[in-house]
């Protein structure tokens, strides 16, 4: 009779995970008489997968009956393949004794699994930046296989270049993840951007995965501040106007100061978005002139999204006679009418003995 | 290591049943074929029948088909050899034994269950 | 069905010497390059064990004193140098179709 010969057709098989996986082998002899087992690996540490002969392998079952006369057809089949699952499988044919004794291996056949990545899911930096500064966005994705896969960035559909990728580990493994960090120059018309990292493998079919970041998380835009006064003729009073406008994120509090001291505070909220979407909010202070004898320094002060105060301040001049004013950024003022002047709110008193 | 365990000693009387069972480990019991054997005082060896207990398909030896029923309990990893209608010429010690190869062989045998047929 | 017919019924040999039992059977028993022909012992008191298999195959903790040839027909089990614990009857077993058995051969000490 001819010498034994174990043989795996197969140099390799990839199967994608969740399917199942046949690894074929036959044996050209009936001799010697003894049971097939297979193994993930060579050498010492090999890991038993199938035993024909003895112990329970749930996943794996030989795909013909091992009790078919002169059988000589040992493939296997695995079911719902994990990329845990990959690595080289060697068919090994024993001699029956005790214990068996190994007689021949096949050439082995390598078991690839074909893993998708997960979702790719993007960070934005920590803290917010400005205009004209760089922020860096990280996309990863994980458990995928084989190796190959391609990343891409894109802000608003065009596709970016300044970004680094990594894909680890660098080395054979049953599954893999991707790192990528693209640096993004922020404008003040970044609040409605966005960033998409895109990622494409053969699992995919075509189909990549994507995954996005709003810039609104990443971007401060600081308030443009511009005081105005207009009078009102009744009851000697001005007008002040503080414009704060194009700013994001909504967080911002506003506080008048009169000659220094606090006078009136607000935190501003449910503003109207711009189109951009920034928020434009306006406030007001009513001053009553005829309550000072000199002129009254008013300050706006803004502290938006937790950053230093930003102050505008503007003088209100009070002089001999009243006068009509406009929009002017220092009046003058007269009046000797000191009655006091209640807004809605209690809080605001402008009466100064 | 691959041992078959069979049932105790029966006395029957002629024209009774008795079923002998075999206990198989140290191996996967629905991998091989168990063979069942007898043997007369003093005389040779006759093939009975076998059984595969992965699906039980059986294969007979002509003149025990009418007789012989081979089951088997795969829970238990047990075989079982049923003979009907005995007679005195059923006196002998009933072997099973496991076919390693599926060669149709008789790799590994129990140690006998005497039936002993008498009135 | 295929008949296996052994010779001699029994043999006495001294020890140390050849022994040689045949069995011949009714058809060929070869099949796809094998001949499927076992050889058991089997000793007083004991289940038979099996020697060889597909004809020339030495069984797994044999000793290496007995072996088997033939194809075809007719076979041969060969002690090349007999033992006292050999002394058995000694069985054929065709399995080319379902199994039989030959009648035996008793080996004894000369």
């Known amino acids: 009779e001819e010498e034994l010969q174990v043989i795996q057709p197969e140099k390799s098989v990839s199967v994608a995970a969740g399917d199942s996986a046949t690894l074929n082998c036959t044996v050209t002899s009936l001799i010697p008489v003894g049971p097939i087992q297979w193994f993930r690996g060579a050498g010492p540490g090999r890991e038993l997968i199938y035993h024909q002969k003895e112990g329970h392998f749930p996943r794996v079952t030989s795909v013909s009956e091992s009790t078919k006369r002169n059988n000589m057809d040992f493939s296997i089949h695995i079911s719902n393949i994990t990329p845990a699952d990959a690595g080289t499988y060697y068919c090994v044919k024993f001699r029956k004794g005790s214990p068996d004794v190994e007689v021949k291996s096949g050439a082995g056949t390598e078991l690839s699994v074909r893993a998708k990545p997960s979702a790719p899911v993007v960070s934005g930096p920590a803290v917010r930046a400005t205009a004209e500064h760089t922020v860096s966005f990280t996309c990863e994705s994980h458990g995928f296989s084989p190796r190959d896969i391609t990343l891409k960035w894109f802000k608003n559909g065009n596709e970016l270049s300044d970004f680094q990728t990594n894909v680890d580990p660098a080395g054979k493994s049953v599954s893999y993840s991707i790192r990528s960090t693209a640096r993004v120059v922020l404008t003040r018309r970044d609040v409605h951007s966005q960033v998409i990292c895109e990622v494409a493998h053969v699992t995919l079919q075509g189909d990549p995965l994507r995954g996005t970041a709003n810039l609104s998380e990443a971007i401060r835009v600081p308030p443009f501040l511009e005081v105005t006064q207009q009078s009102m003729r009744a009851d000697n009073q001005v007008n002040v106007t503080c414009q704060v406008t194009k700013f994001y994120p909504q967080r911002l509090q506003l506080t008048w100061l009169e000659n220094g001291n606090v006078s009136r505070t607000e935190m501003a909220s449910a503003l109207p978005e711009n189109k951009d979407g920034t928020y434009n909010w306006t406030s007001w202070l009513l001053v009553n002139v005829s309550a000072h004898r000199d002129d009254v320094k008013l300050t706006c002060q803004v502290e938006h999204d937790g950053q230093p105060a930003v102050n505008k301040s503007f003088s209100v001049k009070v002089s001999a006679h009243p006068k009509e004013q406009g929009s002017n950024t220092a009046a003058e003022n007269t009046g000797t009418n000191e009655r006091d002047y209640k807004d809605d709110d209690d809080k605001h008193h402008h009466h100064h003995h | 290591q691959v041992q078959l365990v069979q049932s105790g000693a029966e006395v029957k009387k002629p024209g009774a049943s008795v079923k002998v069972s075999c206990k198989a480990s140290g191996y996967t019991f629905t991998n091989y074929w168990i063979n069942w054997v007898r043997q007369a005082p003093g005389q040779g060896l006759e093939w009975i029948a076998m059984?595969?207990?992965?699906?039980?398909?059986?294969h007979y030896n002509q003149i025990f088909k009418d007789r012989a029923t081979l089951t088997t309990d795969t829970s238990t990893s047990t075989a079982y050899m049923e003979l009907r209608s005995l007679r005195s010429d059923d006196t002998a010690v009933y072997y099973c034994a496991m076919d390693y190869g599926s060669l149709y062989a008789m790799d590994y045998w129990g140690r006998g269950t005497l039936v002993t047929v008498s009135s | 069905d295929i008949v296996l017919t052994q010779s001699p019924d029994s043999l006495a040999v001294s020890l140390g010497e050849r022994a040689t039992i045949n069995c011949r059977a009714s058809?060929?028993?070869?099949?796809?390059?094998?001949?499927?022909i076992f050889w058991y012992q089997q000793k007083p008191g004991q289940p038979p064990k099996l020697l060889i298999y597909?004809?020339?195959n030495l069984d797994s903790g044999v000793p290496d004193r007995f072996s088997g040839s033939g194809s075809g027909t007719d076979f041969t089990l060969t002690i090349s140098s007999l033992q006292a614990e050999d002394v058995a009857v000694y069985y054929c077993q065709e399995s080319r179709e379902l199994p039989t058995f030959g009648q035996g051969t008793k080996l004894e000490i000369k």
């Open positions: 059984i595969d207990p992965s699906d039980s398909e059986t």
């Open positions: 058809k060929s028993v070869s099949s796809s390059g094998y001949n499927y």
């Open positions: 597909l004809a020339s």
